[in-house]
Interface confidence: low
């Protein structure tokens, strides 16, 4: 349906004086052109008094007739003022003037809220010529209204420089409340009070709100809008809503879950990413957080040999990325390690516990107590040692590696020489004379070789001289092959 | 192929909250984690948080109290929800999946561009 | 958190010429969860480097990444028109995850 908003013929004719000549009901235009621009609105409305001549902006001609009489002033006439109806309705209103035919070229055009109408609107002029005068009628018309067209509309002419507006015509759309804010979904702490917020308008105006829990009704008595609702506290998870309520009818919001804040669930899916000597590079994947982000991880790591004592290595990171790198370890050993993370309210249970083991590494300190001594009769050099701690071999010895170096006047000579690794001396070949050997060992594992010991010296005097003084050090070595004793 | 496509506004009022959704393709939701990193002249590229498969979130500190990340596995959605943004946090506002192995951000959205103004 | 500094902030470099920009971190990172992204005007960031010194298919074989610890470098071997970019560096090990400022390559 179309609400037209027309002026009344009668009492007043639709273009009153001085021009002769009024319209009639079945003039047929001369011209129906549409406008530059064109809309769609729809309102309800009753008219005012039509017909009489606008006294607000008018336009005073300066031409005269060929009787030198001066033209009147020219004025929008009155129309209706005010329309209400409601959303998806279609209306239709106008605007009308009579223009002294010496005018050429009148265009009307349509504003709205300070703003010109152009564009695909349904905006059409009517002329209608007389002998002195030309009636136009300016009309709008919109099919289906939606809230986005209340405003105020006005027409507009330009005649010698000079702009004419008529009254304006306010469309008042009205329909079902509008939300303008929904209450929130929120993550909150068992038994704490907490707010939700809901705002709908119209036109038409009052809206009241219900609020809805679970699908019951929480409040009696409506609230004007805007409401907030104090919820004391939850011991579960609810559904809350709100209804807002004007004379059109009610609209309901979304529905939005109050979820209780809880401890996460245990981290899953704990698995081993990279291994070394001394470190194990572990990566999770994180449980439910429970509503509330996670805060930081704990990881827990204790050795899985039934013989040690049991002890717990907690080692804490923060929450992102699922990843951490334990370091510190002993060296092929076996590890139980677990993962837990926290959120605001607390920790999470253990994750499933996954066993991991460290890889060889090269042993971290040197064979001990290097003892070295002169063999004159055999013309060898005999170098005795004690290996390093079980703990610190990071590995199973496969053997050691002697250097030995020759330093005599301006000549310096290193060889290496490796040995298995059961024994704990060695013998290797004097290799020059009345010079000074410098020996050093080291240990060596599948994981690498470890450091040597301090250099422990002794001098090789010449053909026939004898030092039985063995020169030793309580320092660690690193070595190459040579005859085991 | 991998693709994540980007929606929301590109003005937000001061004090008014942005929201994003990413609808992601040839991977799902429930395999793949997705992140959040914004790029603004001032700052550069700054990570803001993560939605895992899990449907577990971690998000970056700085910006925890305003942040919110959610998701739709059935429809493929990932949603971004900021609040109170100031002119500062005017940026282009990145989805982007993180990948299995490495761990890294293999694929981007086109990036949302967002100016804070009244 | 840990701060990435890329250097230089900006290079031109011809076509044909090596071209090396390096990345510190403030903090050790291990090398696993170092990258590089390349990014163009208008575009996205692009993962062009991961885990220090692989590169995904499609980023040409004149790119590479070394380092570890603090210290990690992006070289391209012989500068090409469309190495035209700007790099970033990336750590996923520690949160929050952090990039670097970028280092903008110009062609000369």
């Known amino acids: 349906a179309i609400t037209e908003a027309r002026e009344e013929a009668k009492p007043y004719p639709l273009f009153p004086g001085p021009f002769p000549g009024s319209l009639q009901t079945d003039h047929t235009p001369l011209l129906s052109l549409p406008h530059a621009s064109g809309y769609q609105p729809a309102l309800m409305f009753s008219p005012t008094q039509p017909g009489r001549p606008h006294t607000g902006n008018v336009a005073i001609p300066q031409v005269t007739s060929v009787e030198s009489k001066p033209l009147p002033p020219l004025a929008f006439k009155h129309t209706v003022g005010h329309i209400i109806l409601s959303e998806h309705k279609g209306v239709k209103f106008n605007c009308s003037i009579s223009v002294p035919n010496i005018y050429q070229d009148t265009t009307i055009s349509w504003w709205k809220d300070g703003k010109e109408l152009l564009g695909a609107h349904h905006a059409i002029t009517q002329f209608y010529p007389d002998d002195e005068v030309t009636a136009i009628i300016a009309s709008f018309s919109i099919t289906s209204v939606q809230r986005s067209d209340n405003g105020s509309y006005i027409c507009k002419m330009k005649i010698n420089n000079e702009e004419i507006v008529s009254d304006p015509i306010y469309i008042e759309v009205q329909g079902l409340p509008h939300f303008t804010k929904q209450p929130e979904s929120m993550n909150v702490t068992r038994n704490t009070a907490f707010n939700l917020t809901c705002q709908a308008v119209g036109p038409p105006e009052p809206v009241n709100i219900f609020w809805v829990q679970n699908s019951s009704r929480v409040n009696e008595q409506p609230e004007k809008s805007p409401s907030v609702l104090t919820v004391p506290g939850l011991t579960e998870m609810a559904v809350f809503s709100c209804e807002a309520h004007n004379d059109k009818g009610l609209t309901v919001s979304k529905g939005v879950q109050i979820n209780i804040k809880a401890i996460p669930s245990p981290p899953t899916e704990v698995s081993i990413r990279n291994s070394t000597a001394h470190s194990i590079l572990i990566s999770w994947v994180p449980g439910f957080d429970g509503y509330s982000p996670f805060r930081n991880c704990s990881i827990q790591v204790k050795e899985a040999d039934p013989l040690s004592n049991g002890s717990v290595m907690i080692f804490n990171t923060s929450a992102l990325p699922h990843l951490y790198q334990i370091k510190q370890l002993q060296a092929l050993a076996n590890y139980s390690i677990g993962v837990s993370c926290m959120n605001e309210i607390g920790w999470s249970a253990v994750s499933p516990w996954i066993l991991a083991s460290t890889t060889e590494g090269a042993p971290s300190v040197a064979p001990l107590n290097v003892t070295v001594f002169l063999n004159e009769s055999s013309d060898n050099v005999d170098i005795r040692w004690m290996k390093p701690p079980t703990k610190q071999q990071d590995g199973e010895l496969v053997g050691y590696r002697i250097s030995h170096v020759w330093q005599s006047a301006g000549i310096s000579k290193e060889l290496l020489e490796e040995v298995g690794q059961n024994g704990s001396r060695a013998r290797i070949s004097v290799q020059v004379h009345n010079a000074t050997c410098t020996v050093r060992i080291a240990a060596v594992t599948r994981g690498g070789v470890g450091p040597f010991s301090d250099p422990v010296k002794i001098f090789i005097p010449a053909h026939g001289w004898v030092d039985y003084a063995p020169s030793s050090t309580p320092a660690p070595g690193n070595a190459d092959p040579v005859l085991i004793i | 192929q991998v693709q994540l496509k980007q929606s929301g506004p590109g003005l937000v009022q001061p004090s008014q909250s942005l929201s994003i959704t990413c609808t992601v393709s040839g991977f799902s939701l429930t395999d793949y984690g997705v992140h959040w990193v914004r790029q603004s002249p001032g700052k550069g590229l700054e990570w803001l948080g993560v939605i895992w498969s899990s449907g577990t979130t971690d998000y970056n500190e700085a910006f925890i109290s305003r942040l919110s990340i959610s998701k739709d596995n059935s429809k493929s959605h990932v949603f971004f929800k900021m609040n109170s943004l100031q002119a500062i946090d005017t940026a282009i506002y990145y989805c982007?999946?993180?990948?299995?192995?490495?761990?890294?951000?293999?694929?981007w959205g086109q990036g949302t561009s967002v100016t804070v103004s009244s | 958190q840990i701060v990435l500094t890329q250097s230089p902030a900006i290079m031109s470099a011809s076509l044909g010429e090596r071209v090396t920009m390096t990345c510190t971190a403030s903090?050790?990172?291990?090398?696993?969860?170092f990258h590089w992204y390349q990014q163009k005007p208008g575009s996205s960031p692009k993962l062009w480097i991961y885990s220090t010194s692989n590169l995904p298919s499609g980023v040409p074989a004149r790119f590479s990444g070394s380092g570890s610890g603090t210290s990690y470098s992006l070289t391209i071997s012989s500068m090409e028109a469309e190495d035209a970019a700007t790099y970033y560096c990336h750590q996923y090990y520690r949160s929050p995850l952090t990039f670097g400022a970028g280092t903008k390559l110009e062609l000369k």
């Open positions: 903090s050790s990172i291990s090398s696993s969860y």
């Open positions: 982007a999946r993180k990948g299995h192995d490495p761990y890294a951000m293999d694929y």
